[in-house]
């Protein structure tokens, strides 16, 4: 059976029907359906006016405008809001009421596309294998990234989150139109990896999506990941404005100027250094989501009531931090180079600025405990990877799972750890599953391009597709049309159960309490440490171009610090605010050919895509299970002003009193302020745009970051918090 032309809200579309073997099964593929009008720079997406005749949806459209991997030119287009659909078909009737899976790509909110990299004439995010093996409809789409997707002044002049609103437009389009393709509009599952996983999480928390999403899967990224929310957007907006010659003294004038600046110039005005970094990569990425008081009405930690009815899977790769650790500390992948205590202490101190010397020392001590018994370089390098994995991915994911569970009504919660080792031959043998290694298995690459893979890789891929698509069908990864290798138990706050995904799976694959000691450390011990004040945490911003390596902090910490013996000398302070996700060198969707895998085939595996970040804001709590953070103040208090030289600190996300940014839709009315302190009343929705949602009740409205004082830009506020 095949669909032929399908009528959508924009008009008729016609795809391609691809036959699958001799049994008569096929897949209808639609590429390049517009889900919104061509974008205007730094404006919310608008509905597409439609077309006459039948749109031939046979080729992927260009990605959204972004810098190339070399960051010296751009590719993609401003007219980029298109989606792609794969519909599996049997021999006789056309499919009806199929579950729908919508993929959100990663790439640091800086790069990427709905189709991904092309290798062996097969795109990374080609939905065919998932669709046909799992009997689900797969949808992928483009959204704006980088400055065009996320530049914000932190107020109503440029509220930001344009890329998130693009994502929402795609989700809403699917809800309204997917029935015509044979999908069930009441059974939509979002899934995504890295910045895409965090986006999935944010979409479930946004009041704009109320009633649109049934289930969600976050792979290596959640809304609570420390690289997801930009707390000092004005700093980054000004960096770009200066570069393109816009005035920075007045936010309204700056915003108007930025809107009429050549989008390519805006894109190229922001560069991320990829080598010779003085600080961890996460400190250099500034264009990510913000708390705008509207689409993201409050700190994500306080929005979990909005996801109370959404089934949720979240997980990480066992060495998600490897790619970032190897950029921050290149010795990790070099057998002839050593990681020293000094190196690691310096890295730790850069992640723990807000807790000063004690934060650096206690964290260093916790992570190096095993070094006494095993001082081998392999153990030390694994420690560095574990540290970045914990901070950037694992701990925030555990907190997100605990929050989801604590707020869930009927919804189920599942956790996983993906441990099938990386196939990059240039990596040391001890490297496990690196960031983005999971994507190729979810998208069935071992089946689509078999020459690059081994039978064990197909086993992993088959299992992941089965769990993922069963979950999309029923909300339970064990139940559906696909057999699974072992039973995956739900996550509860009591058992902290998670499924370890490997090439050999059985009853022992169901495990409990992943890295509990480290989780407890970050959410209890570290959180309780006092936040440093005044000059103890005075960051020095990058000088000149935003891509320039920042000047290191002045004072004793210019040289690599040694582990402290007393309480002298504050650790070095990184240059930026608390957000950002570095790009991964060859990203999953760059054109650069990936390194071929080991084994007997020359076909490469999918290279890492994705992003990174900074430490999470942990909850308080006192039990052994991952503590559920309070719904009020979401973490450490904000860093106090650093002397008289910097902009004011980010207000606390608790009861700060600062008014929310007025909504950016048609309505000028501000969001309704909450009454009472209930944690579970979900935020009422609004539609695709316009009328503002009511922020959640509770004692934390997470007022959007106020614009920083234009006259004092000498230093950047240190707002990295756990």
């Amino acid at each position: 059976a095949k669909l032929g032309a399908v009528y959508t809200e924009g008009g008729f579309v016609e795809g391609v029907n691809k036959k699958l073997g001799l049994l008569g099964d096929s897949v209808d593929i639609f590429k390049g359906i517009p889900f919104a009008a061509p974008t205007k720079a730094l404006e919310n997406p608008q509905p597409h006016p439609g077309w006459q005749g039948t749109l031939k949806a046979k080729n992927f459209k260009k990605r959204c405008l972004q810098a190339t991997i070399t960051q010296d030119s751009t590719y993609g287009d401003e007219d980029c809001l298109y989606l792609n659909i794969w519909v599996p078909q049997g021999r006789k009737q056309v499919s009806r009421d199929l579950p729908v899976m919508i993929w959100i790509y990663g790439g640091a909110f800086l790069m990427g596309s709905g189709h991904g990299a092309n290798f062996l004439n097969n795109y990374l995010y080609d939905g065919e294998e998932i669709a046909t093996r799992g009997n689900v409809i797969v949808v992928t789409f483009n959204y704006r990234v980088g400055p065009l997707g996320f530049l914000s002044t932190g107020d109503a002049n440029l509220p930001g989150n344009y890329g998130l609103r693009d994502q929402h437009m795609a989700i809403a389009w699917v809800k309204r139109n997917i029935a015509a393709f044979g999908g069930d509009p009441n059974n939509i599952t979002l899934f995504g990896e890295s910045a895409g996983g965090a986006s999935v999480s944010l979409q479930t928390l946004s009041p704009y999506n109320k009633g649109l999403i049934r289930r969600a899967i976050s792979q290596s990224g959640v809304a609570l990941s420390p690289w997801v929310i930009q707390k000092n957007p004005l700093f980054w907006a000004k960096k770009v404005a200066e570069k393109v010659g816009c005035p920075v003294g007045d936010a309204a004038r700056m915003a108007q100027c930025l809107k009429v600046t050549d989008p390519r110039a805006l894109t190229l005005a922001y560069k991320v250094p990829l080598a010779g970094l003085e600080y961890p990569m996460l400190h250099y990425v500034g264009f990510v989501p913000v708390i705008d008081g509207d689409f993201i009405p409050a700190d994500p930690i306080n929005l979990y009531a909005n996801a109370a009815d959404i089934d949720y899977i979240a997980g990480t790769n066992n060495m998600d931090g490897h790619i970032f650790a190897s950029i921050d500390m290149p010795a990790i992948n070099k057998g002839n180079k050593k990681v020293t205590e000094e190196d690691f202490y310096k890295l730790v101190s850069e992640f723990t600025i807000t807790k000063g010397l004690r934060g650096a020392k206690t964290t260093f001590d916790v992570y190096t405990e095993s070094w006494a018994q095993d001082p081998s370089q392999e153990n030390k390098k694994k420690t560095v990877v574990d540290f970045e994995t914990d901070v950037l991915f694992l701990v925030p994911t555990e907190i997100a799972l605990a929050q989801h569970r604590a707020n869930a009504k009927s919804a189920k919660t599942y956790a996983y750890l993906f441990s099938h080792p990386s196939r990059m031959p240039v990596y040391p043998k001890w490297v496990g599953a690196d960031h983005a290694d999971d994507i190729q298995y979810v998208f069935g690459k071992p089946f689509a391009t078999p020459t690059g893979y081994r039978p064990q890789d197909r086993t992993v891929s088959k299992a992941m597709i089965a769990y993922w698509t069963n979950f999309a069908k029923t909300g339970d990864p064990n139940m559906g049309d696909s057999a699974v290798p072992t039973h995956w138990e739900p996550y509860t706050t009591e058992n902290s159960g998670y499924l370890e995904i490997t090439k050999k799976m059985g009853s022992s694959s169901m495990k409990r309490s992943l890295r509990t000691n480290f989780l407890r450390y970050w959410t209890l011990t570290y959180l309780a440490l006092p936040t440093v004040t005044d000059q103890e945490a005075t960051p020095v911003p990058p000088t000149g171009d935003s891509e320039a390596t920042p000047v290191p902090p002045t004072g004793d910490s210019e040289t690599a610090p040694v582990p402290p013996t007393g309480d002298s000398g504050a650790p070095p302070v990184p240059p930026t605010g608390d957000s950002g996700a570095p790009p991964v060198p060859p990203t999953g969707d760059s054109g650069a050919p990936p390194v071929p895998p080991t084994g007997d085939s020359g076909a490469p595996p999918v290279p890492p895509t994705g992003d990174s970040g900074a430490p999470p804001v942990p909850p308080t709590g006192d039990s052994g299970a991952p503590p559920v953070p309070p719904t009020g103040d979401s973490g450490a208090p904000p860093v106090p002003p650093t002397g008289d030289a910097g902009p004011p600190p980010v207000p606390p996300t608790g009861d700060s009193g600062a008014p929310p940014v007025p909504p950016t839709g048609d309505s000028g009315a501000p969001p309704v302020t909450p009454t009472g302190d209930s944690e579970t009343a979900p935020v009422p929705p609004t539609g695709d745009s316009g009328a503002p949602p009511v922020p959640p009740t509770g004692d934390s409205e997470a007022a959007p970051v106020p614009p920083t004082d234009d006259s004092k830009e000498a230093q950047m506020p240190a707002v990295i918090r756990f």
């Epitope: 009528y7 959508t8 809200e9 029935a179």
Partner: antibody, heavy 119, light 105 residues
Framework: QVQLVQSGAEVKKPGASVKVSCKAS????????MHWVRQAPGQGLEWMGV????????SYAQKFQGRVTMTRDTSTSTVYMELSSLRSEDTAVYYC????????????WGQGTLVTVSS | DIQMTQSPSSLSASVGDRVTITCRAS?????LNWYQQKPGKAPKLLIY???SLASGVPSRFSGSGSGTDFTLTISSLQPEDFATYYC????????FGQGTKLEIK
């Protein structure tokens, strides 16, 4: 100017079929989708389906799937709507309506055709 | 299917009055169209894409809203405006509201 002229009123017995025509003029026939909307006596408007006169592609509302067929004749710039297995509740005025621009705003309407289903 | 709920279902007003008719969509929609229908006549397009006036429609008619809540406003009622008004959503299966009958008080 755009004109849509529909065929005359019909009286049909339950179980029979009816075929209503809609002749278009004043614009390029194959460039705009044509929709069919019906209105039962004293009731609201109900969308039945749409045809692209350019390639004949159709889409029908779930409620009418299997009972309705929309066709076109480009040589006479006419679209047709046939409804089978008629029941008394199909008694209504049937309108053809052309897209205004883009998609979905129904900018130009025929005068309507009353179909009465009665035994 | 997307549900469209119009309110009120009927309304009495006088010439010169300002009148507002609302239409609520569930779930949210992208665009809304408004039509006017007089007894024994075919409907006539008034407003398309939420707020754009169809050609030949007087400027006293205006539309606004987004997401789930939309309004049609007639700023100063004229005798010829007494009719039934329908909203319509645009999706793969367009649906109309049940109509609002505007009568002379």
């Amino acid at each position: 100017q755009v004109q849509l002229v529909q065929s005359g009123a019909e009286v049909k017995k339950p179980g029979a079929s009816v075929k209503v025509s809609c002749k278009a003029s004043g614009y390029t026939f194959t460039s705009y989708n044509m929709h069919w909307v019906r209105q039962a006596p004293g009731q609201g408007l109900e969308w039945m389906g749409v045809i692209n006169p350019g390639d004949g592609a159709t889409s029908y509302a779930q409620k009418f799937q299997g009972r309705v067929t929309m066709t076109r004749d480009t040589s006479t710039s006419t679209v047709y709507m046939e409804l089978s297995s008629l029941r008394s509740e199909d008694t209504a005025v049937y309108y053809c309506a052309r897209d205004y621009y883009g998609s979905s705003p129904l900018g130009y309407w025929g005068q309507g055709t009353l179909v009465t289903v009665s035994s | 299917d997307i549900q469209m709920t119009q309110s009120p279902s009927s309304l009495s007003a006088s010439v010169g009055d300002r009148v507002t008719i609302t239409c609520r969509a569930s779930p949210s929609i992208s665009y809304l169209n408004w039509y006017q229908q007089k007894p024994g006549k075919a409907p006539k397009l008034l407003i398309y894409a939420t707020s754009s006036l169809a050609s030949g429609v007087p400027s006293r008619f205006s539309g606004s809203g987004s997401g789930t809540d939309f309004t049609l406003t007639i700023s100063s009622l004229q005798p010829e405006d007494f009719a039934t008004y329908y909203c319509q959503q645009r999706s793969s299966s367009p649906t109309f509201g049940q109509g609002t009958k505007l009568e002379i008080k």
